[in-house]
């Protein structure tokens, strides 16, 4: 299996945005790569978002996706938006080298994303 590296822990910003790098050790010269972000929480795994891209080009997520990303060589910079405290969990990066054959699959160990909902601002007395 292809090795995929990602940070162990990331803290989301107060605006609910978390970014991390997913890096894969490509065994071949892939031209088309598929990246999927999976969320594991309470032993349940769900797909957060997925994108296919040509090497050297931008990642194309669906219009309604909460993810955006850019690629550079064998690195993918992923950003997940709109996160709330309930979205805290392990976010796993899955990379598939689709074309040309052969197919390679790599799954990272996951990035624990912590999301803290901001405290509501107290009313100001003037």
């Amino acid at each position: 299996a292809m090795h995929v590296a990602q940070p162990a822990v990331v803290l989301a910003s107060s605006r609910g945005i978390a970014s991390f790098v997913c890096e894969y050790a490509s065994p071949g010269k892939a031209t088309e790569v598929r990246v999927t972000v999976l969320r594991q929480a309470d032993s349940q795994v769900t797909e957060v978002c997925a994108a296919t891209y040509m090497m050297g080009n931008e990642l194309t997520f669906l219009d309604d996706s909460i993810c955006t990303g850019t690629s550079s060589g064998n690195q993918v910079n992923l950003t997940i938006q709109g996160l709330r405290a309930m979205d805290t969990g392990l976010y796993i990066c899955k990379v598939e080298l689709m074309y040309p054959p052969p197919y390679y699959l790599g799954i990272g160990n996951g990035t624990q994303i912590y999301v803290i909902d901001p405290e509501p601002c107290p009313d100001s007395d003037f």
Epitope: T31, E32, T52, Y53, M54, T60, M98, Y99, P100, P101, P102, Y103
Partner: antibody
């Protein structure tokens, strides 16, 4: 039910051109890579060309590179093969096939016959 | 290109017989070996992919085995409807290539 229907075959003179079409239904076309495979009369199967689901990747058999162009229109659920500079040895039944599993063709159309003859 | 060599090119067997078709690749193709069935005058159909996985709707009398360069398609009990030409195909590297086919007939 997955359905693939080819059209556009016919008789053409050497050096001529043809455009084959394949209309897909019964599945989400934009999720799948597609291929063209041909079979000369009484012969075996020969892979011709492949295009990935979003058309990012396109590949051809060596003998077809430069003469054939595979393309797709996901909005129309359609696959195409533009064939130029046709030769007698291109005479075959041309099948369109879905690449539903990595590098295997899981559903095939009924085929369209291309005859190159003077 | 990876060459795929099938044997025999044709065979004749009785209903109920166990039939074995072999396919040899000119280099290691890992598990990217697929089998197709083409009945006379009909369209090819995927039978088996990844060496041994049956495609949907394929009877369990069909099975696949092998590894690396040598692969086998087995029909455990030949039925009249199995009369067809069988092709192997490698998906390990482009161009994808097929074996020459094995024509199976009933005695």
């Amino acid at each position: 039910e997955v359905q693939l229907v080819e059209s556009g075959g016919g008789l053409v003179k050497p050096g001529g051109s043809l455009r084959l079409s394949c209309a897909a239904s019964g599945f989400t076309f934009s999720d799948y890579g597609m291929a063209w495979v041909r079979q000369a009369p009484g012969k075996g199967l020969e892979w011709v060309a492949f295009i990935s689901n979003l058309a990012y990747s396109v590949y051809y058999a060596d003998t077809e590179t430069g003469r054939f162009t595979i393309s797709r229109d996901n909005a129309k659920n359609s696959l195409y093969l533009q064939m130029n500079s046709l030769r007698a040895e291109d005479t075959a039944v041309y099948y369109c096939a879905r690449s539903g599993l990595p590098y295997a063709m899981d559903y095939w159309g009924q085929g369209t016959t291309v005859t190159v003859s003077s | 290109d990876i060459q795929m060599t099938q044997s025999p090119s044709s065979l004749s067997a009785s209903v109920g017989d166990r039939v074995t078709i072999t396919c040899r690749a000119s280099q290691d193709i890992s598990n990217y070996l697929n089998w197709y069935q083409q009945k006379p005058g009909k369209v090819p159909k995927l039978l088996i992919y990844y060496i041994s996985r049956l495609h949907s709707g394929v009877p369990s009398r069909f099975s696949g085995s092998g590894s690396g360069t040598d692969f086998t398609l087995t029909i455990s009990s030949l039925q009249p409807e199995d009369v067809a030409t069988y092709f192997c195909q490698q998906g390990r590297m482009l161009p994808w290539t097929f074996g020459g086919g094995t024509k199976v007939e009933i005695k």
